[in-house]
Interface confidence: low
């Protein structure tokens, strides 16, 4: 990510105590928060600043992906003297401020977690009254989302020499183990993990040659659960169909 010259002396694990009036900008966020898909998570963020008794207008911002440049997922603004931070942006309506920015707390609640929410989040506060100042966490908090397996695609495809192959793709965190079962197969573990970048939760398993007609079942399993889907191969009818 782009580095800036903003002073970002952030202490994530241990809040430094600074004696007044030499308080300086700092932000305290944990390295990581973990939760299951479908649940809610709280991203803690507290800060200190050098402007004693500041009660002017302020904006609280959370962004995802990278600091300073990542897309905003939440933004709220508080008028002078107000403890109410009026929400201006909440991506998909799932982000809600839990903390009170007037009390140096920007903690955010994320509802209905999905695997796509598994990324790093950065909190930022901006003062815009008599004092113009801003500060953003540099390394942010990693939201680690876990999920039971879900088979996202199962299909039968033609392969050379009039043969057929089957593909099964599942998502989950931890990435699930995949196994195929079917006619004359027993259990075939043929999982090939996709690269982590961008598709870190997807796993694909291929059956390269389907030798018998019948039902082929893909099972995805991780520590949180399991999921099954099947495809049916009918070569003699000149078609293949899938049923889940």
């Amino acid at each position: 990510f782009v580095r800036t010259k903003i002073d970002t002396t952030e202490n994530l694990l241990n809040t430094e105590v600074h004696s007044s009036p030499a308080q300086r900008w700092s932000m305290q966020v944990p390295p990581e928060v973990s939760a299951e898909a479908g649940d809610a998570a709280v991203l803690p963020c507290t800060f200190t600043h050098p402007h004693r008794h500041y009660d002017g207008p302020l904006t609280a911002i959370w962004r995802a992906g990278e600091p300073y440049a990542g897309p905003q997922v939440f933004r709220c603004a508080a008028a002078r003297g107000s403890e109410l931070c009026q929400t201006a942006l909440s991506l998909h309506g799932r982000f809600r401020l839990l903390g009170n920015p007037r009390r140096n707390d920007l903690s955010l609640r994320v509802e209905r977690l999905a695997l796509a929410d598994d990324r790093r989040y950065f909190c930022r506060v901006e003062f815009a009254g008599d004092v113009h100042d801003r500060y953003e966490s540099r390394h942010g908090v990693r939201l680690h989302v876990t999920a039971a397996p879900r088979i996202v695609n199962i299909s039968v495809l033609p392969s050379p020499a009039h043969a057929f192959r089957a593909l099964c793709t599942a998502e989950g965190e931890p990435p699930p183990a995949l196994a195929w079962s079917g006619p004359a197969l027993g259990n075939s573990l043929a999982a090939v993990r996709s690269p982590r970048e961008g598709h870190g939760h997807l796993v694909t398993a291929e059956l390269p040659a389907l030798t018998h007609d019948g039902r082929y079942t893909c099972t995805a399993a991780n520590s949180l659960g399991r999921s099954e889907a099947s495809v049916y191969l009918f070569r003699f009818h000149g078609a293949s169909g899938a049923s889940t």
Epitope: T8, L13, N14, P31, S34, R138, H139, R142, H144
Partner: antibody, heavy 120, light 107 residues
Framework: EVQLVESGGGLVQPGRSLKLSCAAS????????MAWVRQSPKKGLGWVAS????????YYGDSVKGRFTISRDSAKSTLYLQMSSLRSEDTATYYC?????????????WGQGVMVTVSS | DVQMTQSPSNLAASPGESVSINCKAG??????LAWYQQKPGKPNKLLIY???TLQSGTPSRFSGSGSGTDFTLTIRNLEPEDFGLYYC?????????FGSGTKLEIK
């Protein structure tokens, strides 16, 4: 194969300083948070300090804050722990550990450890 | 800090048997507990995290259970290489804290 090899331990008098090193290999050093964890017969395993990818942020356990400094040199794939104002209770085996990339609060690889004895 | 209490401190068993090691957190840590194995002359090994998820390379005879404050590591059908020290660690919050350890010995 991931390898972490600590060095620099030994016998040191109370109040003096010592610097530990940890040579990392088998992975991209700059992609991981790193840590020092220590173990003594009295206190068992205890987290000492951690450092982020590029050394910008450092984190310390309460018992060493202000006395120990964790640092890293990505060009050398080496982690350091500068220990000053050493006390007898700092006597322990010190392990270099790699933070797991998915769970930043776990240690997925450890070194064999290096012994530090603080005694007069 | 979250206090981690591990029991028993010593355990003797024979190959083929099953054993359980307990770990109790001073406050709720959700499911975020890890187990490590320590053997002389070898680096510590992460076995289980998030209470029950096996780290890659951990044999299936190891299993973890529990949530909140009470957790258990179970080893079924003990193999000779399973003997050694076991530690729990909460990975719910900083500072990261460990249990005091359980020494598993051959009977």
């Amino acid at each position: 194969e991931v390898q972490l090899v600590e060095s620099g331990g030994g016998l040191v008098q109370p109040g003096r300083s010592l610097k530990l090193s940890c040579a990392a290999s088998g992975f991209t050093f700059s992609d991981y948070y790193m840590a020092w964890v220590r173990q003594s017969p009295k206190k068992g395993l205890g987290w000492v300090a951690s450092i982020d990818y590029d050394g910008y942020n450092t984190y310390y356990g309460d018992s060493v804050k202000g006395r120990f400094t964790i640092s890293r040199d990505s060009a050398k794939s080496t982690l350091y722990l500068q220990m000053s104002s050493l006390r007898s209770e700092d006597t322990a085996t010190y392990y270099c550990a790699r933070h797991d990339s998915r769970f930043g609060s776990l240690f997925d690889y450890w070194g064999q450890g290096v012994m530090v004895t603080v005694s007069s | 800090d979250v206090q981690m209490t591990q029991s028993p401190s010593n355990l003797a068993a024979s190959p083929g048997e099953s054993v359980s090691i307990n770990c109790k957190a001073g406050k709720s840590i959700s499911k975020y507990l890890a187990w490590y194995q320590q053997k002389p002359g070898k680096p510590n090994k992460l076995l289980i995290y998030s209470g029950s998820t096996l780290q890659s390379g951990t044999p299936s005879r190891f299993s973890g259970s529990g949530s909140g404050t009470d957790f258990t590591l179970t080893i079924r059908n003990l193999e000779p290489e399973d003997f050694g020290l076991y530690y729990c660690q909460q990975h719910n919050e900083y500072p990261l804290t460990f249990g005091s350890g359980t020494k598993l010995e051959i009977k």
